[in-house]
């Protein structure tokens, strides 16, 4: 069974709490 | 060139209302969210309201709720800012300011003044 | 709300002395914690996002530190066009609020 693997750079910006929904989806889409 | 320009400010009276705009230019202005901050003659800066890039989500400053509305127009690229029952303490220079994801403002406008006098 | 204390309000340093600035959020903002330049008649200018990242174009010299409630902005050596006033912003939760300011003049 495929497991998947989350690769993060640990220099992303992170999303401010306030632009996720309840659901935790991201409201906006750019990084910048 | 990357842009946000406001405009509407002016003299009005207490009680009075004025709408302000804020034209967005060289940049998807329907990705961002996107913030009114102002600042008080000689004071600090004051964070006002923001909205989610589709406009479905708006967050205010308490001193503000229930007379300030903030909305957008994305098919114009323009950010507005409703303001009603003006006091004397609104007295300031507003900026629209867009948001990056992290919530900080990258990119601002020159600012447009709004006095409230009699 | 997420009081930001800014200190000190104000300070005298020369051409080429190390700045330090320092911001303390009233409860933990991780690290949602900007840094802006303003000068008198213009519009503030990001400096550091994120507590520790260098917006783009803004030079080495300036520099962040620090989450949860202590942060910290660093001019190395600074430059004539450094004099400004500075301000902190926590981005963890709303309302958005600032510092209030420290400005920096030439001695």
């Known amino acids: 069974e495929p497991v998947v693997v989350h690769i993060t750079d640990d220099n992303e910006e992170p999303i401010a709490p306030y632009h996720f929904d309840l659901s935790g989806h991201a409201f906006g889409a750019m990084a910048c | 060139q990357v842009q946000l320009q406001e405009s509407g400010g002016g003299l009005v009276q207490p009680g009075g209302s004025l709408k302000l705009s804020c034209a967005a230019s060289?940049?998807?202005?329907?990705?961002?969210?996107m913030s009114w901050v102002r600042q008080a003659p000689g004071k600090g800066l004051e964070w006002v309201a923001n909205?989610?890039?589709?406009?479905?989500?708006?967050y205010y400053v308490d001193s503000v709720k229930g007379r300030f509305t903030i909305s957008r127009d994305n098919a114009k690229n323009s950010l507005f800012l409703q303001m009603n029952s003006l006091r004397a303490e609104d007295t300031a220079v507003y900026f629209c300011?867009?948001?990056?994801?992290?919530?900080?403002?990258?990119?601002w406008g020159q600012g447009t003044t709004v006095t409230v006098s009699s | 709300d997420i009081q930001m204390t800014q200190s000190p309000s104000s300070l005298s340093a020369s051409v080429g002395d190390r700045v330090t600035i320092t911001c303390r959020a009233s409860?933990?903002?991780?690290?949602?914690l900007n840094w802006y330049q303003q000068k008198p008649g213009k519009a503030p200018k990001l400096l550091i996002y994120?507590?520790?990242s260098l917006q783009s174009g803004v030079p080495s010299r300036f520099s962040g530190s620090g989450s949860g409630t202590d942060f910290t902005l660093t001019i190395s050596s600074l430059q004539p066009e450094d004099f400004a006033t500075y301000y902190c912003?926590?981005?963890?939760?709303?309302?958005?609020?600032f510092g209030g300011g420290t400005k920096v003049e030439i001695k």
């Open positions: 300011a867009r948001e990056r994801q992290s919530g900080a403002f990258g990119l």
């Open positions: 060289e940049f998807t202005f329907n990705n961002y969210w």
């Open positions: 909205i989610k890039p589709d406009g479905s989500v708006k």
């Open positions: 409860q933990s903002i991780s690290s949602y």
């Open positions: 994120a507590a520790s």
């Open positions: 912003q926590q981005s963890y939760s709303t309302p958005l609020t």
